[in-house]
Every structure is written in structure tokens, then in C-alpha cells.
């Protein structure tokens, strides 16, 4: 097999996944744009494997090679960037592991996150020793151009020294680059000789260009940025939760749903219910009550679990996480069964897969 | 039964606007989503979107989007669709159907259809 | 030009068994279920197989849906006279991020 690597990121925490409104965070893979990558589907006995990017189904191609577990993509682009799933389908049931490729380095210029040698890039000189600006860091500074998810974030580095200091400002497409120019505005850090702009959208396409000046001379460094859509769609919920589970009358029990999506999703917990020993009406739709909804004083985290307290028999049935965002809608559905206590002891038997 | 009943038939001028409802009778209104086909003469399906009242959001087709407006009124179990800056194309029937999301965006029921037509 | 494919027409003798198709791609068929509906002449849809092969009441069991990879089929068996009309498969697309019909089947009963 052809060894392709992907270095799973753990470091990049302040980096936020493309996905904009994604409640649950799955893992995210980063690579450059032109590295061959590869990721392996991390679901046990998996007995036929299917890949899905963003919701729509994923099958080989002159670059995307689907071979066992593994899902290799060569030269990758901004493009390939997205939320992707592996389904192990097995005999009884199906899993599904979701993750984040993003293609970008998204800290751009060489950077990380936190700065950490920033102050080496500020170079104190001898008063007595005039100089004109120079690059103190080019490796910084090599990737010109920087192909970038919607909604990421981005770093432009032009770290110099000179004496006297120099100071930097930005340009962009050839002019003054003023915070106005862009919702949100952008920093400047003169420390660590940097650009940052936040949730970058289309319209910051452009070309960006340092100006580093003294009194003795000046020096410029212009960067490409190319922002890269990611194509939105309704909410994908995990797949296997929420799952199926029993408890003894008196126990607890709850339902996870995990839930991404690009727009802001609305999510509500329906119970299918019976209305006079019946669970249709008489249009033949079945009777749903809305048992939690997302609203001012539920956060995200809190409308991912149900819980259901001091268990009854009148709570078993059909419990379903209903998601909807404005591209569409997503569902899916568990069962509770509800046992007779034992005695007087309270007993509960839940699968691990969906108890936290 | 829970039955779809339409408002009539509507004859508009090329740049107009036309509204045309729908009413839900005998049955559940909030709990599904009310979809809006088309079909012009001859022709066949055209799904233009939806509001889904459970969570007070409406989805478009891409084709119709800035053009169209599906709103829905819960208290009389009225739903509406809008159709802006008309053109002779947009001659056609339109049809409004509850989308059973559990049905995976099944239209289980239709209403009766509402002859819109463009001519100057 | 519509995103499903289906023959525009299809034909039987009554008592027949007659297959009408459904082509889509990844994005529609290959992703998400199908539903199929039945135009009689001069009247409004109606829903005949939904969620690729579930009938809802009152659709005789004489039809039936399947589905596999990014194309779908409907079938009619015992074709009887009453099925002349047009026939349209539907699923939503993650492409277009909306439902997308076939452009229709006519079945003619000879």
C-alpha cells in the first residue's frame, strides 16, 4: 500500500472547523494543499465500509482511492476540505464515525496559534547600527498563496527588523487596507509582525501586502488569499444515536443526539404519544409531543441529551431528535423499553454507545 | 381526513406578484412541513420550497430564491406562497403538500392546485 | 431538463408486469430515499411508494419500490386500466439542497 500520512491535530484548538454551527465537535485532520492524505476509518469490525463527504456519498475517483479502511485523497485541495463519515454497515447494525479534513494551513504564513516565537521575531538593534527594514523570517514567509475555508481564520506574517524599529501596515488589492473595509475588521499585531483576520468570508479575496518602512528604506511582501466555499446542507445527525434503550420503572435513562451543521440548526426531542388508546389521529399522522426544544435557556450542549427521570411505563415508545436548519431537515429516531423492577432493586441496562 | 384546500384561480401581470394559500383542514397542521410544487402545462414537478411551522423556518429551492416567500399563519392552519417579479414562464399550477419529514420529505397530501396564469 | 432521469414513456397489456426507472446520482438517489407518485389526468399527485419501498394505506400491494446504488424502479403488477397516467420519482439532492423530481413516466395501458 502506498504510505500516504495525515497528522491528526491536536494542537490547533483556537482554530475553529469549517463547520460554522457544528454542536458536536468531531475530530479535524489537517493538511497543505498538494500533500497526499490519508485517514483511516476508526471503527471496529467493519465488515463494508462506505464514505460520505458533507452528507453526499463518496466514491473513488482519479483522486480520491477507497481501499479497505483507509481513504486516501492525492494532491488535496481547499476543496476537499468538509465533514466526512465512515459507516462500518455490519450484519446486525451500522456506525458511523464522523471527522473534519481541512485543507489549508490555516494559521497561515508558518505560524501557530499561540505566537510562541513571536519574540523572536522582534529584533532589538544597536542604536548605533542604522539599518534599513529587512526580512528577519522568509521561511515565514514563503506560501504565497493561501487557499482558505469560509469561516476560518487567518494569519499573514511579515516579521522584520531594521534601525529604528520599522513599522508595518497593510495593503490590500494595492490599497490602504482599513478596518471598515471588512465586517468584523481585522488585528494587527506589531509584536509579532501579523495580519489576522476572523471568519473569513468571499469578499476578503484579495491580494494582501506588508509595508515595512523607516526612515532608511522600505520593504513589501504581498500574500494571495483565496477564500473557498464549502457548500452548505442540512443538519447531518450521528449516525447510531440517537440508540435504543431499556431501563426498569424508577431508573433514568437519556438520549444522545449529535447533530452538524453549517446554518444555525433548530433541534427538538418528540415523543410519539397515544391520545385516547390511540396513536394516530384521525388524519393519519401520528401524535407528537415536543418534549425539548432549543430556546433562550437550553444551550447547544443541553439540547444534545434528553434525560428522562424516575422512568415510568408510560414513557416507553419512540423518542426522535428532529433537526432543522434552512436547508432542510434531519431526523432520527431510538426506542425506549421500559422493564418491571426487580424486587424492590432499580436496575438499568443501557449500551455504553449512547451513556456518557 | 385531513384535507388541503387551496385558494383560486389567479390571472397576473408580467412583474406582479401573485399569493396564493393554502388551508389545512381536519387535521395536524404544526407537527409537518407544507411543501409548494409547480407544474407548468405539459410539463412536470417543480419543488419550490417549504415551511416547516415546528420550527418557524421555511426552505427554498435555489432556482426561486430572493423570488419566493412561504410563510404560514398557525392559527387558522394556513400556509402561503408568494411568487414576486412574474414572467410568462412562471404560468403553471401550483400545488402546496404536506411534507412528512418521518417519510423522508414524502408529499402525502396535495391540495387541488391553483391555476396561475402570467399574461400581459 | 430534469436532475432524475426517468423513460418519458412506458407501456403494458392489463394483467402485466411493467418497471418504470428512476436514474439520479451520489447526491440525490445515492444519499438520500426515494418517493414515487402517480398523476391520473387532470388531477393532483398522490404518493404511491415513499422512503424507497413503503406503501402508504390504501396503495394496493400491487405496487412496489426498490432501490440500489443511484437508481431506483417502480413496479406494477396485475397492470390494470385505472394506472394510465404519469408517474414521477422524487428524493432530495445535498447538492441542490432541495427535493428534485423525474420529469415523469406516462404508462399507457394497451
Known amino acids: 500500500r502506498p504510505s500516504f500520512s495525515l497528522v491528526e491535530d491536536t494542537t490547533l484548538e483556537p482554530e475553529e472547523p469549517p463547520t460554522k454551527y457544528q454542536i458536536s465537535q468531531p475530530e479535524v485532520y489537517v493538511a497543505a494543499p498538494g500533500e497526499s492524505l490519508e485517514v483511516r476509518c476508526l471503527l471496529k469490525d467493519a465488515a463494508v465500509i462506505s464514505w460520505t463527504k458533507d452528507g453526499v456519498h463518496l466514491g473513488p475517483n482519479n483522486r480520491t482511492v477507497l481501499i479497505g479502511e483507509y481513504l486516501q485523497i492525492k494532491g488535496a485541495t481547499p476543496r476537499d476540505s468538509g465533514l466526512y463519515a465512515c459507516t462500518a454497515s455490519r450484519t446486525v447494525d451500522s456506525e458511523t464515525w464522523y471527522f473534519m479534513v481541512n485543507v489549508t494551513d490555516a494559521i497561515s504564513s508558518g505560524d501557530d496559534e499561540d505566537d510562541t516565537d513571536g519574540a523572536e521575531d522582534f529584533v532589538s538593534e544597536n542604536s548605533n547600527n542604522k539599518r534599513a527594514p529587512y526580512w528577519t523570517n522568509t521561511e515565514k514567509m514563503e506560501k504565497r498563496l493561501h487557499a482558505v475555508p469560509a469561516a476560518n481564520t487567518v494569519k499573514f506574517r511579515c516579521p522584520a527588523g531594521g534601525n529604528p524599529m520599522p513599522t508595518m501596515r497593510w495593503l490590500k488589492n494595492g490599497k490602504e487596507f482599513k478596518q471598515e473595509h471588512r465586517i468584523g475588521g481585522y488585528k494587527v499585531r506589531n509584536q509579532h509582525w501579523s495580519l489576522i483576520m476572523e471568519s473569513v468570508v468571499p469578499s476578503d479575496k484579495g491580494n494582501y501586502t506588508c509595508v515595512v518602512e523607516n526612515e532608511y528604506g522600505s520593504i513589501n511582501h504581498t500574500y494571495h488569499l483565496d477564500v473557498v466555499e464549502r457548500s452548505p446542507h442540512r443538519p447531518i445527525l450521528q449516525a447510531g444515536l440517537p440508540a435504543n434503550a431499556s431501563t426498569v420503572v424508577g431508573g433514568d435513562v437519556e438520549f444522545v443526539c449529535k447533530v452538524y451543521s453549517d446554518a444555525q440548526p433548530h433541534i427538538q426531542w418528540i415523543k410519539h404519544v397515544e391520545k385516547n388508546g390511540s396513536k394516530y389521529g384521525p388524519d393519519g399522522l401520528p401524535y407528537l409531543k415536543v418534549l425539548k426544544a432549543a430556546g433562550v435557556n437550553t444551550t447547544d450542549k443541553e439540547i444534545e441529551v434528553l434525560y428522562i427521570r424516575n422512568v415510568t411505563f408510560e414513557d416507553a415508545g419512540e423518542y426522535t431528535c428532529l433537526a432543522g436548519n434552512s436547508i432542510g431537515i434531519s431526523f432520527h429516531s431510538a426506542w425506549l423499553t421500559v422493564l418491571p423492577a426487580p424486587g424492590r432493586e432499580k436496575e438499568i441496562t443501557a449500551s455504553p454507545d449512547y451513556l456518557e | 381526513q385531513v384535507q388541503l384546500v387551496q385558494s383560486g384561480a389567479e390571472v397576473k401581470k408580467p412583474g406582479s406578484s401573485v399569493k396564493v394559500s393554502c388551508k389545512a383542514s381536519?387535521?395536524?397542521?404544526?407537527?409537518?412541513?407544507i411543501s409548494w410544487v409547480r407544474q407548468a402545462p405539459g410539463q412536470g414537478l417543480e419543488w419550490m420550497g417549504r415551511i416547516i411551522p415546528i420550527f418557524g423556518t421555511a426552505n427554498y429551492a435555489q432556482k426561486f430564491q430572493g423570488r419566493v416567500t412561504i410563510t404560514a399563519d398557525e392559527s387558522t392552519s394556513t400556509a402561503y406562497m408568494e411568487l414576486n417579479s412574474l414572467r410568462s414562464e412562471d404560468t403553471a399550477v401550483y400545488y402546496c403538500?404536506?411534507?412528512?419529514?418521518?417519510?423522508?420529505?414524502?408529499?402525502?397530501?396535495w391540495g387541488q392546485g391553483t391555476m396561475v396564469t402570467v399574461s400581459s | 431538463q430534469s436532475v432524475l432521469t426517468q423513460p418519458p414513456s412506458a407501456s403494458g397489456t392489463p394483467g402485466q408486469r411493467v418497471t418504470i426507472s428512476c436514474s439520479g446520482s451520489s447526491s440525490n438517489i445515492g444519499s438520500n430515499t426515494v418517493n414515487w407518485y402517480q398523476q391520473l389526468p387532470g388531477t393532483a399527485p398522490k404518493l404511491l411508494i415513499y422512503?424507497?419501498?413503503q406503501r402508504p394505506s390504501g396503495v394496493p400491494d400491487r405496487f412496489s419500490g426498490s432501490k440500489s446504488g443511484t437508481s431506483a424502479s417502480l413496479a406494477i403488477s396485475g397492470l390494470q386500466s385505472e394506472d394510465e397516467a404519469d408517474y414521477y420519482c422524487?428524493?432530495?439532492?445535498?447538492?441542490?439542497?432541495?427535493?428534485?423530481f423525474g420529469g415523469g413516466t406516462k404508462l399507457t395501458v394497451l
Open positions: 422524487a428524493a432530495w439532492d445535498d447538492s441542490l439542497n432541495g427535493v428534485v
Open positions: 381536519g387535521g395536524t397542521f404544526s407537527s409537518y412541513a
Open positions: 403538500a404536506r411534507d412528512r419529514w418521518d417519510w423522508n420529505d414524502a408529499f402525502d397530501i
Open positions: 422512503s424507497n419501498n
